[in-house]
Amino acid sequence: TLNSVLNSNAIKNLPPPLGGAAGHPGSAVSAAPGILYPGGNKYQTIDNYQPYPCAEDEECGTDEYCASPTRGGDAGVQICLACRKRRKRCMRHAMCCPGNYCKNGICVSSDQNHFRGEIEETITESFGNDHSTLDGYSRRTTLSSKMYHTKGQEGSVCLRSSDCASGLCCARHFWSKICKPVLKEGQVCTKHRRKGSHGLEIFQRCYCGEGLSCRIQKDHHQASNSSRLHTCQRH
């Protein structure tokens, strides 16, 4: 169920001043699509780990990636899995824990001095081979902040949206990802009917801009529900 909530296995920080108890007592928290919420007052420990369903890496924590729990499993069933440590096997950067990236199928340290050259080489390799290293998924902040010293302009190669300049997002284009404009009001957007379905897109659209959501165009009457046009509309 979606109300599986994780907690770290140690309390590292005291409550802040005026703090309340864990779980925000007296305040019910609920979810919208793709949203995380606690089950009542209880938080599970990592030892009691219950995986969280996801559609992409960005929905998971920074120490997780989104994938099918079984090898060759149903692509429609994906959960947040713990990231892979150094020297473990990987297929893309997001599988490796922060401070590492995927090179030749192995998680290696993103050593600041050699990092940029190696990453560029990896990107080149991914175009020439089976696209297994960069398949259009995001990498963590620690990786992208070392990789990109300036924010990418439209068309620049990126790994995640924070690599792109304001007003752009990082979206799939063939088997890489590039910075594309965030959608404006009235522009056509993609509404995913099931989790994981956007893994099939090779030309991914950005999300709708702030204050907009992707909804069926009111005046767009078609026989098939699935073929209705979605556009970015004010909330």
């Epitope: 864990a22 998971c60 920074t62 120490d63 997780e64 963590r140």
Partner: nanobody
Framework: EVQLVESGGGLVQAGGSLRLSCTAS????????VGWFRQAPGKEREFVTG????????YYADSVKGRFTISRDNAKNTAHLQMNSLKREDTAVYYC??????????????????WGQGTQVTVSS
């Protein structure tokens, strides 16, 4: 270390709107969960809404669902809370907080490591 500063609070009539901003200094912001909490006079601080490191997940207290919207811009190290259809009971000091977003979950309040000083929101009838 992350420093958080809230802005945008003020006096507004019931039914009106306000947009709060939370500006962070420090690189850890873009890998942190951001939450908004509020504390009304004589009451405990309560969770209002939260957003994960990437903006792909958001969560809301039932009392604000459908009226409040949280968003973030990691490129600008900011988070926003758009508050519409404000009610008298929304009157409180609003705090922005952030903490490490290592796992897909709602972060319990004690794990928020960095807190702003708060901004007052007063809704009059």
């Amino acid at each position: 270390e992350v420093q958080l500063v809230e802005s945008g609070g003020g006096l507004v009539q019931a039914g009106g709107s306000l947009r709060l901003s939370c500006t962070a200094s420090g690189r850890a912001f873009s890998s942190s969960v951001v939450g908004w909490f509020r504390q009304a006079p004589g009451k405990e601080r309560e969770f209002v809404t939260g957003i994960n490191w990437s903006g792909a997940r958001t969560y809301y207290a039932d009392s604000v669902k459908g009226r409040f919207t949280i968003s973030r811009d990691n490129a600008k190290n900011t988070a926003h809370l758009q508050m519409n259809s404000l009610k008298r009971e929304d009157t409180a000091v609003y705090y922005c907080a952030s903490g490490r977003d290592r796992y897909a979950r709602v972060l319990p309040e004690y794990e928020y490591e960095w807190w702003g000083q708060g901004t007052q929101v007063t809704v009059s009838s």
